[in-house]
Amino acid sequence: LQIQCYQCEEFQLNNDCSSPEFIVNCTVNVQDMCQKEVMEQSAGIMYRKSCASSAACLIASAGYQSFCSPGKLNSVCISCCNTPLCNGPRPKKRGSS
């Protein structure tokens, strides 16, 4: 089974690289997850994304969980997911009506 992910190997400033030009086909039977690294810097929020094997992504996300402090300078958050394009933009919250 082949999964698609958003991929930007180098950090993108305030651009979560979730547009169609960043979509890639992951390596069949090897890369079964999408991963995302979000780093908070003084200049803004930096994003890196790629395909990954489940082991690679889980090693990184588990080993570096303590580095994730959203809203804090130099916070680094790693996330892994296994559905197509799941490392894209967060779903917009619906406004209450």
């Epitope: 190997e9 180098e10 950090f11 992951c26 390596t27 090897v30 890369q31 991963q35 690294e37 780093m39 810097q41 003084s42 200049a43 930096m46 890196r48 790629s50 395909c51 990954a52 094997s53 082991a55 690679a56 090693i59 990184a60 080993g63 570096y64 580095f67 130099n74 680094v76 790693i78």
Partner: antibody, heavy 120, light 107 residues
């Protein structure tokens, strides 16, 4: 036990080619980036390039771009550095090292290095 | 490319001394900096990752600090086995350049 073992170094004439191997054991290379770093005699460390074996994605330092190629054979758990059009300034000890994809990780395991001498 | 400027290039110190080595990045690299120790004829060894986190098995006399562009490696009380060359490296964006190295010699 995690180990990286380089081999393939030796004496080669300018313009010649050499292929270095980096055999990994104790971990699976598809879970890491494999980086090549070199050190000329009496000089500092120079980052040469890296491969993500799970995708084959590579990146090279400008000094070797177009002449060196990094590849990996995941079935052998081994990475390679193919060096073509070698120059005297490529003379160095070549190390391979592993690093997680995450930016803040360090290169936690290194091979012992293999010496490449480019001379006529 | 991001440059890493390390200083001093060499220093002489005695056992028990406090030693400080600095590294400056040419642009903001957040905390994506590691420090390595290398002894003659040996491969480098990871000491510090993410600018300030001590790698497993490294003695607590080693510490790192900094973020953005300015980073420091400190050895609180130099031991005989610490005489070596130290390198900083960023891994913020390829190429992952190293500093020029600092050789710590016996006074």
């Amino acid at each position: 036990e995690v180990q990286l073992v380089e081999s393939g170094g030796g004496l080669v004439q300018p313009g010649g080619s050499l292929r270095l191997s980096c055999a990994a054991s104790g971990f699976t290379i598809t879970n890491y980036g494999i980086h090549w770093v070199r050190q000329a005699p009496g000089k500092g460390l120079e980052w040469v390039g890296r491969i993500y074996p799970d995708s084959g994605a590579t990146y090279y330092a400008d000094s070797v771009k177009g002449r060196f190629t990094i590849s990996a054979d995941t079935s052998k758990n081994t990475a390679y550095l193919q060096m073509n059009s070698l120059r005297a300034e490529d003379t160095a000890v070549y190390y391979c090292a592993r690093k997680l994809w995450i930016s803040i990780a360090g290169m936690d395991y290194w091979g012992q290095g293999t010496l490449v001498t480019v001379s006529s | 490319d991001i440059q890493m400027t390390q200083s001093p290039s060499s220093l002489s110190a005695s056992v028990g001394d406090r030693v400080t080595i600095t590294c400056r990045a040419s642009q903001d690299v957040s905390t994506a900096v590691a420090w390595y120790q290398q002894k003659p004829g040996k491969a480098p060894k990871l000491l510090i990752y993410s600018a300030s986190f001590l790698y497993s098995g490294v003695p607590s006399r080693f510490s790192g600090s900094g973020s953005g562009t300015d980073f420091t490696l400190t050895i609180s009380s130099l031991q005989p086995e610490d005489f070596a060359t130290y390198y900083c490296q960023h891994s913020y964006a390829t190429p992952f350049t190293f500093g020029q190295g600092t050789k710590v010699e016996i006074k």
